[in-house]
């Protein structure tokens, strides 16, 4: 028996369900009751799911996973995962044994997509060319970790004097701020994109500074 | 009539080199996983290692990892143990079976043995 | 130490029935299934149950075989005199990814 599983990571969203494709190729005459599935956390071993003596046994992981029964008999071992959560990620192993045994293992990436970003200024008030100002990008609630990326008015990278921390709430997910501490010029656009590298998507903020008032 | 017929046992010293066969008949063996048990003098089974049926997936017990080797040679229909760095503790008959439903081995040969003594 | 745990010895007279237990945990027997392999003096093992219950072809049906959560056991009824043996539990185990046989139980028909 060969098992087979993507090659690709599964890429799953927070708080939507994920399928791990794990298939195998039965044997003419094969039937259920020969069939022992396994379904396991590859790096600790730790159980998740198992389909033996001709019976679903049920989830053995949070009570969030299922097979699916009607697909089995035609060699479709794939594991549903609901309502994923960060501590999910990982790599997870299909064991198959029937009268031969194999295994593979997929991959699951977990994402969440950050927030528009919102800009802050300090000073915010009586600001004139040649004044120091902070500016901080703050964008919530994504997976993985961001990368952050300011520009000015013309597209040029701003690399000195950006801060940038990400902290994690207890759901795992990132708050990332980032400061950039900038001379004025007589006006200007400064801009901040967050980026999640899983789901190449990029929220943008910005803040243009043109004597009063503030544009943001 | 299926049958496994193990050899290739004897006694070394510790320290030494075995390669224990296994020639099968009587089922397709190409079709089915296989494995190795063993059986120290007056012990119960502990089993050995596992090979599926094209030797891609391959599992061994912990109290032999990195020093044995189990392989197969479909074409031959014969499994194969290799046994490195021997330890008095590996005294043992050797098991050669045969893959079967839900994690059973429904075939077992008559067994080969294996004496490592100084 | 065996993963799965067997009583060393068991007895019974004949015509009676004895069973044998044997309890592993969710990883194994909970997660999967149960074998049973019976062991003649000085003869190789020989498959007597799997899949907990099912006998394969030849195995009188006084053998039977049971599964309960994370434990299960061996029962023969009618005991016989050529029924004095070694018996073995197995199982896969999930969290070590190796399969684990029980210590053995040695029955002595009396």
């Known amino acids: 028996v060969e098992v087979q599983v993507s090659e690709d990571p599964v890429v799953a969203l927070v708080d939507t369900d994920a399928t791990l494709r794990c298939s195998f190729s039965p044997e003419p005459g094969f039937s259920l009751a020969q069939l022992n599935l396994i379904w396991q956390l590859t790096d600790t071993k730790q159980l998740v799911h198992s389909f033996t003596e001709g019976r679903d046994q049920g989830s053995a992981y949070s009570n969030r996973t299922a097979l699916f029964p009607d697909l089995l008999v035609q060699g479709n071992a794939s594991l549903r995962l609901q309502r994923v959560r960060v501590t999910d990620e990982g790599s997870y192993t299909c064991f198959v044994s029937i009268q031969d045994f194999d295994s593979a293992a997929v991959s699951l990436q977990v994402a969440a997509p950050y927030s528009k970003p919102s800009m802050t200024l300090e000073p915010n008030k009586d600001l004139r060319p040649g004044n120091m100002v902070t500016i901080t990008c703050s964008s919530y609630q994504g997976y993985p970790e961001a990368e952050v990326f300011w520009k000015d008015g013309q597209g040029v990278p701003l690399t000195g004097n950006v801060t940038t921390s990400q902290m994690a709430n207890e759901r795992g997910l990132f708050d990332v701020h980032s400061v950039l501490r900038v001379v004025l010029g007589a006006n200007g656009t400064y801009s901040c994109l967050v980026r999640n590298p899983v789901l190449q998507q990029d929220a943008h903020g910005s803040v243009t500074i043109t004597g009063q008032p503030l544009t943001f | 009539e299926v049958q496994l017929l193990e050899s290739g046992g004897g006694l070394l010293q510790p320290g030494g080199s075995l390669r224990l066969s296994c020639a099968a008949s009587?089922?397709?063996?190409?079709?089915?996983?296989m494995h190795w048990v063993r059986q120290a003098p007056g012990k119960g089974l502990e089993w050995v290692a596992a090979?599926?049926?094209?030797?891609?997936?391959?599992y061994y017990a912990d109290s032999v990892k990195g020093r044995f080797t189990i392989s197969r040679d479909n074409s031959k229909n014969t499994l194969y143990l290799q046994m490195n760095s021997l330890r008095a503790e590996d005294t043992a008959v050797y098991y050669c079976t045969k893959y079967y439903y839900h994690y059973a081995m429904d075939v077992w040969g008559q067994g080969t043995t294996v004496t490592v003594s100084s | 130490q065996s993963v799965l745990t067997q009583p060393p010895s068991a007895s019974g007279t004949p015509g009676q029935r004895v069973t044998i237990s044997c309890s592993g945990s969710r990883s194994d027997i909970g997660a999967t299934t149960v074998n049973w392999y019976q062991q003649l003096p000085g003869t190789a093992p020989k498959l007597l149950i799997y899949q907990s219950h099912l006998r394969p072809s030849g195995v009188p049906d006084r053998f039977s075989g049971s599964k309960s959560g994370t434990s299960a056991s061996l029962a023969i009824s009618g005991l016989q005199s050529e029924d004095e043996a070694d018996y073995y539990c197995?199982?896969?185990?999930?969290?070590?990814?190796?399969?684990?046989f029980g210590g053995g139980t040695k029955l002595t028909v009396l």
């Open positions: 090979i599926n049926s094209d030797g891609s997936r391959i």
């Open positions: 197995a199982s896969w185990d999930a969290s070590l990814n190796t399969w684990v």
């Open positions: 009587g089922f397709s063996f190409s079709s089915y996983g």
